[in-house]
């Protein structure tokens, strides 16, 4: 698995009429300018947006703001010293931090989450740091599409 | 300066083959039709070159400004596959092609290997230890 010697030659890009994930018998694809890593596609912004703007931009790409499975999910960018909006917000109804799909934040993901201000949104650094910041603040953001 | 993103959310976005299709080794990333090994360990330029060769790939090369800005956004610095034999020689790629882009600090005779560092290329001592990344075009 760690070798390129058996690469099949295929066209560099598959033209597609829309931004749906292209799937064929053995292949999935990420949109151009998205990063493919461990069966997921990520869009890593360089522009700064509010949390809501970020959420809408991800949604417009049939993706959502990053939902982390574990703290090494973005291992490939663990050297980054930027913070990015992720898809975590506080639900007054459930009195819990929830991801966009409604699942609850694992207490093991951010040990300091109990000190987060529930009026804020969460900015994440891929090294594992998380900050609660006003949702009106501007940060870069990460969108995620799960392919499997 | 952050690269412009106005085209990134167009409705006719092209697609690229992703790692999980078997085109890139496990734990590599795919971006714009290339596979990248994102190194954590530090090596000299020559050691980095050999490390990438052993992975059947090449020391990081930069094909365009968009790629440079993407990489710079996720990595603080990295060796790239550009060097010169001395300050009297031109900068060349590991494939032997002339490298035309501006490399900072080129006037320093001790700095004969190139580094990508936050949206710019600069020269560095080939014997110093830096993080390296490898690339393989699909």
């Amino acid at each position: 698995k760690n070798s390129f010697t058996k690469l099949s030659i295929e066209p560099a890009f598959t033209p597609g009429p829309n931004i749906e994930l292209q799937k064929d018998s053995d292949c999935c694809s990420c949109q151009e300018k998205w990063v493919g890593y461990r069966c997921n596609c990520y869009f890593i912004s360089s522009e700064q947006k509010t949390w809501n703007e970020s959420r809408h931009l991800c949604a417009s790409q049939k993706s959502s703001l990053l939902q982390l499975q574990n703290t090494d999910e973005l291992d490939f960018m663990s050297s980054s010293q930027q913070f990015y909006w992720i898809g975590l917000s506080y639900s007054e109804e459930h009195t819990a931090w929830l991801w966009e799909n409604g699942s609850a934040l694992s207490q093991y993901l951010f040990p300091s989450f109990e000190t987060f201000n529930t009026k804020n949104c969460i900015a994440y650094n891929p090294n594992g740091n998380a900050l609660d910041e006003s949702c009106e603040d501007k940060n870069r953001y990460i969108c995620k599409q799960q392919l499997i | 300066i952050p690269f412009l993103e106005q085209n990134n959310f167009s409705p006719n976005t092209r697609t690229q083959k992703a790692r999980h299709c078997g085109h890139c080794p496990e734990e590599w990333i795919t971006y714009s039709n290339s596979c990248y090994y994102i190194g954590k360990e530090r090596r000299t330029w020559e050691e980095s070159l050999l490390a990438c060769t052993s992975k059947n790939s090449s020391l990081l090369s930069i094909d365009n400004e968009e790629e440079m800005k993407f990489l710079a956004s996720i990595l603080p610095s990295s060796w790239i596959g550009v060097f010169r034999n001395s300050s009297h020689h031109p900068w060349v790629t590991i494939n032997g092609l002339a490298f035309k882009h501006k490399i900072k600090d080129s006037d320093n005779a001790e700095l004969n290997c190139a580094v990508l560092q936050v949206n710019r290329l600069k020269s560095a001592q080939c014997g110093s230890s830096m993080i390296y990344h490898c690339k393989h075009k699909l």
């Epitope: 050297s79 913070f83 009106e136 603040d137 501007k138 | 710079a72 603080p76």
Partner: antibody, heavy 120, light 107 residues
């Protein structure tokens, strides 16, 4: 190019007030956290306060909490520090500072500083 | 709060010398470390960020290394304009903190 210019420093009596201003230019002001850092004469550097891009997230060092107020006006590209109940130990050069492009919390650009002297 | 301890607090050296200044964090800060140079009457100037990345415009004789708790700033061949005070700073967690400074003097 990035420029940060502080003003408003001067001599003030203990218990008095001062308002420092910082005029920013050469970058998109609303995209960056802004900081105030101070340096007492002959001493090291000390974080005073910072403010997030929208002005909603704010931090103060314990030594100034309750006495200093940081604010910003993104329309005017300006940063402010309102200093009340000043003490002799607040005497310092106050620097307005902007984060580095790549590294949050690292100061990429500093103003020239403005001296605040608290003395009777 | 994370404490940053620099050593030595002062060092005397000559033009052409190689000088190393160390900085130790009281807890791990990954590579969230910066180095600054300050000359009398002037604002500090960023030299190194992310522990080892050289700030644009800074001469290549300056280099940084380290990760976790132990970091070094090295000046490979001292120039007359390098005599100044050097500070390390952690940006890993609030409140961000500076080392106490290392004064580099002419021998």
């Amino acid at each position: 190019q990035v420029q940060l210019v502080e003003s408003g420093g001067g001599l003030v009596k203990p218990g008095g007030s001062l308002r420092l201003s910082c005029a920013a230019s050469g970058f998109t002001f609303s995209d960056y956290y802004m900081r105030w850092i101070r340096q007492a004469p002959g001493k090291g550097l000390e974080w005073v306060s910072h403010i997030s891009t929208s002005g909603s997230t704010i931090y103060y060092a314990d030594s100034v909490k309750g006495r200093f107020t940081i604010s910003r006006d993104n329309a005017k590209n300006s940063l402010y520090l309102q200093m009340n109940s000043l003490r002799a130990e607040d005497t310092a050069v106050y620097y307005c500072a902007r984060d580095h492009y790549y590294s949050r919390g690292v100061i990429g650009y500093w103003g020239q500083g403005t001296l605040v002297t608290v003395s009777s | 709060d994370i404490q940053m301890t620099q050593s030595p607090s002062s060092v005397s050296a000559s033009v052409g010398d190689r000088v190393t200044i160390t900085c130790r964090a009281s807890q791990g800060i990954s590579s969230w470390l910066a180095w600054y140079q300050q000359k009398p009457g002037k604002a500090p100037k960023l030299l190194i960020y992310a522990a080892s990345s050289l700030q644009s415009g800074v001469p290549s004789r300056f280099s940084g290394s380290g990760s976790g708790t132990d970091f070094t700033l090295t000046i490979s061949s001292l120039q007359p304009e390098d005599f100044a005070t050097y500070y390390c700073q952690q940006a890993n967690s609030f409140p961000y903190t500076f080392g106490q400074g290392t004064k580099l003097e002419i021998k």
